[in-house]
Amino acid sequence: MAVTACQGLGFVVSLIGIAGIIAATCMDQWSTQDLYNNPVTAVFNYQGLWRSCVRESSGFTECRGYFTLLGLPAMLQAVRALMIVGIVLGAIGLLVSIFALKCIRIGSMEDSAKANMTLTSGIMFIVSGLCAIAGVSVFANMLVTNFWMSTANMYTGMGGMVQTVQTRYTFGAALFVGWVAGGLTLIGGVMMCIACRGLAPEETNYKAVSYHASGHSVAYKPGGFKASTGFGSNTKNKKIYDGGARTEDEVQSYPSKHDYV
């Protein structure tokens, strides 16, 4: 039951995280005009990965797409790439994890297969979350660098006669959405990986059995160790239990007719 809960929760958390990554990628407010210590302008500038917008105090908002690929900063292109990779990996991870869910039965899919799929989706979620966090962090770093550069040169003018206000940008809402969403996707992925350990059927831990040989008695304990990986890569000699969701301990604590020779 704990495995199913962990897997289900991991799926839901990852789903929310990926939805957040998609939302952050589409949002226009990656960077917003810094209003602190600035003359009060009737225009508010904000920028996203795909377009920049201007909201006027009149209520009118104008957005312009970046209709160039080569003319954009390499960092912005890198952030776009990271976010898209994150979305794609996350989407594939979601698709895989749906089939891996213990509560969903698809034909006669073995637990070992579900465990592998859970692990795969978990890793995908982890990488997806890391991509999103990396993308947002790269953008944030770019903002911080530009902010201090423009602060050093806040006002530019001709001989100090005419002042031109330099627009400074600070963190927009999309950055926080991206960080949180990336973190959730990462957590969801870790939960899936943890759930995978419980899903993987272990080598049967046989009880000690005595073999009576003709001279003297020796005790032989076959399979007296647990699989160290826990990911169910070695499936031979494993017993598949049909009795619903059980923990590792539950699986090994119920003796069956195969326990004694």
Partner: antibody, heavy 118, light 113 residues
Framework: EVKLVESGGGLVKPGGSLKLSCAAS????????MSWVRQTPEKRLECVAT????????YYPDSVRGRFTISRDIAKNNLYLQMSSLRSEDTALYYC???????????WGQGTLVTVSS | DIVMTQYPSFLTVTTGEKVTMSCKSS????????????LTWYQQKPGQPPKLLIY???TRESGVPDRFAGSGSGTDFTLTISSVQAEDLAIYYC?????????FGSGTKLEVK
């Protein structure tokens, strides 16, 4: 059709108060920035109060800050300008105007006259 | 507050003539976010409220004759009437729409002979 009608002007003594109203129709009142612009007898124009569209932030020039208050009643589609501690230099024709592209003012009312005199 | 300086204060022209009036702001009205200049031109005829002619320094309001043209960027702006008509008799005002409070120029009075 956008329509703006000002009212509430009149003769008031220095130090007195007056509340101007502007009845708006023909547009989504809360979505647009609105301004009160006055024109002095010398034909000078001065934007005495602005309320931004959507978030309804308010802005005033130094000459009226602390004495004038702009507000809006979305339910009634009314814009108000509460004027207190009036001075003789506040004598002017007060226009209500709605803003749009470039924060420009494409729509104006016909104005209401405020005379501050003892 | 931003100071808007308009010149000349008076202009006397004959019909059909080309006329140019200027407006200078104490700070740049150019917004880097959209590369637009937040300067507006109005025309006020006697007994009427001001009428919007040009916004964003060079964009003509719908219904405004194409003889009216706005130009300039940053701090220096110009309103040009390519061929003055008798009905163009009015006071022309420029306005800063970038910084609060929005400030107007003192106006240029156009008289037609």
């Amino acid at each position: 059709e956008v329509k703006l009608v000002e009212s509430g002007g009149g003769l008031v003594k220095p130090g007195g108060s007056l509340k101007l109203s502007c009845a708006a129709s023909g547009f989504t009142f809360s979505s647009y920035g609105m301004s009160w612009v006055r024109q002095t007898p010398e034909k000078r124009l001065e934007c005495v109060a602005t309320i931004s569209g959507g978030d309804s932030y308010t802005y005033y020039p130094d000459s009226v800050r602390g004495r004038f208050t702009i507000s809006r009643d979305i339910a009634k589609n009314n814009l108000y300008l509460q004027m207190s501690s009036l001075r003789s230099e506040d004598t002017a024709l007060y226009y209500c105007a709605r803003s749009y592209n470039g924060n420009s003012l494409p729509y104006w009312g016909q104005g209401t006259l405020v005379t501050v005199s003892s | 507050d931003i100071v808007m300086t308009q010149y000349p204060s008076f202009l006397t022209v004959t019909t059909g003539e080309k006329v140019t009036m200027s407006c200078k702001s104490s700070q740049s009205l150019l917004n880097s976010g959209n590369q637009r200049n937040y300067l507006t031109w109005y025309q006020q005829k006697p007994g009427q409220p001001p009428k919007l002619l040009i916004y964003w320094a060079s964009t003509r309001e719908s219904g405004v004759p194409d003889r009216f043209a706005g130009s300039g960027s940053g701090t220096d702006f110009t309103l040009t009437i390519s061929s003055v008509q008798a009905e163009d008799l009015a006071i022309y005002y420029c306005q800063n729409n970038y910084f609060y409070p929005f400030t107007f120029g003192s106006g240029t009075k156009l008289e037609v002979k």
